[in-house]
């Protein structure tokens, strides 16, 4: 499965949609910025087999999809952009799932790195907690949008590293 080819374009499209979703000036939200502790070490990728790497990417995209599928999200973002973004994420999830299935039998190692997936889950829990504490304010969502863009950019680098490994 040539993951990066199918996935990189989708990742770029998702990033562009996220960029377009901004509704308020981020400069009015400087005081709301927060360190969510992105699990960078899980995206360094050296210790992973390909199927494990794909499962971590899948978890990140699944969690992003869940986050932007909430009613609070629908109340914040422009509907047509949100729908396009969700469709893009859904397509990426399908691509990744197909990839994982192809990798079964190719590798002897377990399909999932449980610790890495847990780290990604906890990262998104911190994001959700922050939004709750900030009462889903426009600035809180703006901070989260920037964080997700940053994490997508980092996962893009991760995918490029996977491509080089191939």
């Amino acid at each position: 499965c040539d993951l990066p080819q199918t996935h990189s374009l989708g990742n770029r499209r998702a990033l562009i949609l996220l960029a377009q979703m901004g509704r308020i000036s981020p400069f009015s939200c400087l005081k709301d910025r927060h360190d969510f502790g992105f699990p960078q070490e899980e995206f360094d990728g050296n210790q992973f087999q390909k199927a494990q790497a794909i499962s971590v990417l899948h978890e990140m995209i699944q969690q992003t999809f869940n986050l932007f599928s909430t009613k609070d999200s629908s109340a914040t973002w422009e509907q047509s952009l949100l729908e396009k973004f969700s469709t893009e994420l859904n397509q990426q999830l399908n691509d990744l799932e197909a990839c994982v299935i192809q990798e079964v039998g190719v590798e002897e190692t377990p399909l999932m790195n449980v610790d890495s997936i847990l780290a990604v889950k906890k990262y998104f829990q911190r994001i959700t907690l922050y939004l709750t504490e900030k009462k889903y304010s426009p600035c809180a969502w703006e901070v989260v949008r920037a964080e997700i863009m940053r994490s997508f950019s980092l996962s893009k680098i991760f995918q490029e590293r996977l491509r080089r490994k191939e």
């Epitope: 770029r12 562009i16 960029a19 377009q20 400087l30 910025r33 360190d35 940053r150």
Partner: antibody, heavy 120, light 111 residues
């Protein structure tokens, strides 16, 4: 690769206006904020303001609010800064710089600078 | 506006030794786990180059002899061991609040 190409040296009279350009290539111009920074000869750096080419949203350093006007033309992948009512204090090198890491607001790529000389 | 005071204004360090540059902010630039202080290097006739972001994160491609530390109002850039090519002016910049400001610069000379 990412490049920011700025317009050449400008010589202007006091009281006049100048408009400089910054042509971006090698990345998605509409999805990165673009900062402008001033550097007077032998001196430090001053942040002028920032523009988001995707929607034209701008934020200024209050000190430059009545001095600088930032615009962008997405079809040309070009950002512009117009300086008005020029005085000797405006003689400087002006850099356009790409915002980096989203809301960390650092600057990773810099144009080569446009030199503005104000003289009668 | 937050004022960034860099010290010393200039320093001369022998090849292979340690250079330490300080940047003090008039108000805290740290919030919720991040310190919004960044460091740049500018060589004569060149544009500034990002070295360190968020006080201690090394920018990709920057040699590991550069390191940053600090939080709140006090920040430090260390270069060890210093090499000839490190002769430049170093600036700190904060993005804690508007307007973003830069320090006045520290000129590093290699002995």
């Amino acid at each position: 690769q990412v490049q920011l190409q700025e317009s050449g040296t400008v010589l202007a009279r006091p009281g006049a206006s100048v408009k400089m350009s910054c042509k971006a290539s090698g990345y998605s111009f509409t999805t990165y904020w673009m900062h402008w920074v001033k550097q007077r000869p032998g001196q430090g750096l001053e942040w002028i303001g920032v523009i988001y080419p995707g929607n034209g949203d701008t934020t200024y350093n209050q000190k430059f609010k009545d001095k600088a006007k930032l615009t962008a033309v997405t079809s040309a992948n070009t950002a512009y800064m117009e300086l008005s009512s020029l005085t000797n204090e405006d003689s400087a090198v002006y850099f356009c710089t790409r915002n980096y890491k989203y809301d960390y607001y650092t600057m990773d790529y810099w144009g080569q600078g446009t030199t503005v000389t104000v003289s009668s | 506006d937050i004022v960034l005071t860099q010290s010393p204004a200039s320093l001369a360090v022998s090849l292979g030794q340690r250079a330490t540059i300080s940047c003090r902010a008039s108000k805290s630039v740290s919030t919720s786990g991040h310190s919004y202080m960044h460091w740049y290097q500018q060589k004569p006739g060149q544009t500034p180059k990002l070295l360190i972001y968020l006080a201690s994160n090394l920018e990709s491609g920057v040699p590991a002899r550069f390191s940053g530390s600090g939080s709140g109002t006090d920040f430090t850039l260390n270069i060890h061991p210093v090499e000839e090519e490190d002769a430049a002016t170093y600036y700190c910049q904060h993005s804690g609040e508007l307007p973003f400001t830069f320090g006045s610069g520290t000129k590093l000379e290699i002995k």
